[in-house]
């Protein structure tokens, strides 16, 4: 048999004006009951009984997972990155089959010199992390490689990485135009064929706090939103205080339902409170309105 759970009641008035005696369980949310062995608990909304208490799924909390949290943890990555797939042609080195073998002395030496050269080229770009050769092929040496960029996550990270990729393009174009062979020899660390420089692809980290917030809010996705504090995104409902979108319930309690945030107005010994924001007080003794 199902165990009966005592439910405390509070005298609250809905913003529509009628007095209701509400259990601490939100009656507007669907109820699913989780039973483990002889233990039974009214763990709602997908929550489960762990033998001691209900383990609730986001965005629910409470003794029976009946309440909706006011804020949901979203965790943007500390850093975001971009990967540029580039091809350049090095003319100051003659291709040999050994260069195909990444464990050969030839490859290691080429990799060291090429990396050193690219570190010089991109030295002024704060987002620059390094280069990674993916393939070497004949012609003299066609170098397929990735340029790796990284920056701290901010709401404007895409702009920062987009700008960095543009600077990479400018710098590699400049060096492969200037460092060319003269009299069949190279006086630079490496020389290039100007026409062999190509940007094949650019991949940027995709992180959208709004999307993560909506996904975690599940059926409440339309009522949770993202606000920023100190460049950090917060996934909040209007019931979370201290944000621009916070709902002021004055003489009442903000509660989430599947229809959004609503104010449950309190009744005190001296006043009834009503209105959408529980800001209309009626004195019990004189029935006098205060605004």
């Amino acid at each position: 048999p199902l165990a009966t759970i005592p439910v405390s009641t509070t005298s609250l008035t809905s913003s529509e004006g009628s007095t209701i005696s509400t259990p601490s369980v939100d009656i507007s949310t669907p109820v699913t009951t989780s039973i483990v062995g002889d233990q039974c608990s009214r763990c709602k909304n997908g929550g489960f009984w762990d033998g001691l208490k209900c383990q609730c799924l986001t965005p629910y909390y409470g003794e029976s997972c009946e309440e909706v949290v006011n804020s949901i943890d979203i965790a943007p990555p500390e850093t975001v990155s971009a990967q540029m797939e580039l091809t350049v042609t090095v003319t100051s080195v003659k291709f040999t089959d050994e260069l195909k073998n990444h464990s050969s002395q030839e490859f290691r030496e080429f990799n060291k010199t090429f990396t050193e050269q690219m570190n010089i080229v991109y030295s002024g770009i704060p987002e620059y992390v390094g280069v990674n050769i993916t393939n070497l092929r004949l012609g003299s040496v066609v170098v397929e490689h990735d340029v790796l960029l990284r920056t701290k996550y901010t709401p404007e990270y895409k702009t920062a990485l987009d700008n960095a990729t543009e600077v990479v393009k400018q710098k590699i174009t400049k060096v492969t135009t200037e460092q060319i062979m003269t009299n069949d020899n190279c006086s630079a660390l490496m020389c290039f064929n100007t026409t062999g420089t190509q940007v094949q692809n650019i991949t940027v980290t995709q992180y959208d706090p709004v999307e993560e917030c909506r996904q975690k809010a599940e059926e409440y996705e339309d009522y949770f939103l993202v606000e920023y504090r100190d460049q950090k995104p917060y996934c909040i409902s209007p019931c979370e205080s201290g944000f621009n979108a916070s709902k002021n319930c004055n003489h009442g309690k903000c509660q989430m339902s599947q229809n959004g945030a609503r104010c449950l107005c309190v009744t005190t010994e001296t006043h009834w409170y009503s209105g959408e924001d529980c800001n209309q007080g009626t004195q019990k003794s004189h029935h006098h309105h205060h605004h």
């Epitope: 100051s92 080195v93 050994e98 002395q105 080429f110 190279c186 660390l189 020389c191």
Partner: nanobody, 124 residues
Framework: EVQLVESGGGVVQPGGSLRLSCAAS????????MAWFRQAPGKEREVVAF????????YYADSVKGRFTISRDNSKNTLYLQMNSLRAEDTAVYYC?????????????????WGQGTMVTVSS
Amino acid sequence: EVQLVESGGGVVQPGGSLRLSCAASGYTSNRYSMAWFRQAPGKEREVVAFIWTDGGRTYYADSVKGRFTISRDNSKNTLYLQMNSLRAEDTAVYYCAASSLLLQTINPRAWPYWGQGTMVTVSS
């Protein structure tokens, strides 16, 4: 680890000859470029000549063309520089350099392995 040891330097009169040698050891590859660079007092290091492993390419600086000859004996892992008609301006420390790559560069920074150098003084 690759090691390069030069020998054959010394004092010679203008118009005289010298033969420098460079013994290479520690190479795992049988294909590599070798070069001679030199550095005169107060000047930057400059290329004298280089040669590819198979002798398929040689390069000479304009200042030594027709007077110096670079060669190598792969069986002995040794590089040579035959210097004829020496001039006072050839006075410098001569360095042997190597790379496992077939380098076509005269920039010393592109060459990863270096010997300690041997002094050549041309003076009357």
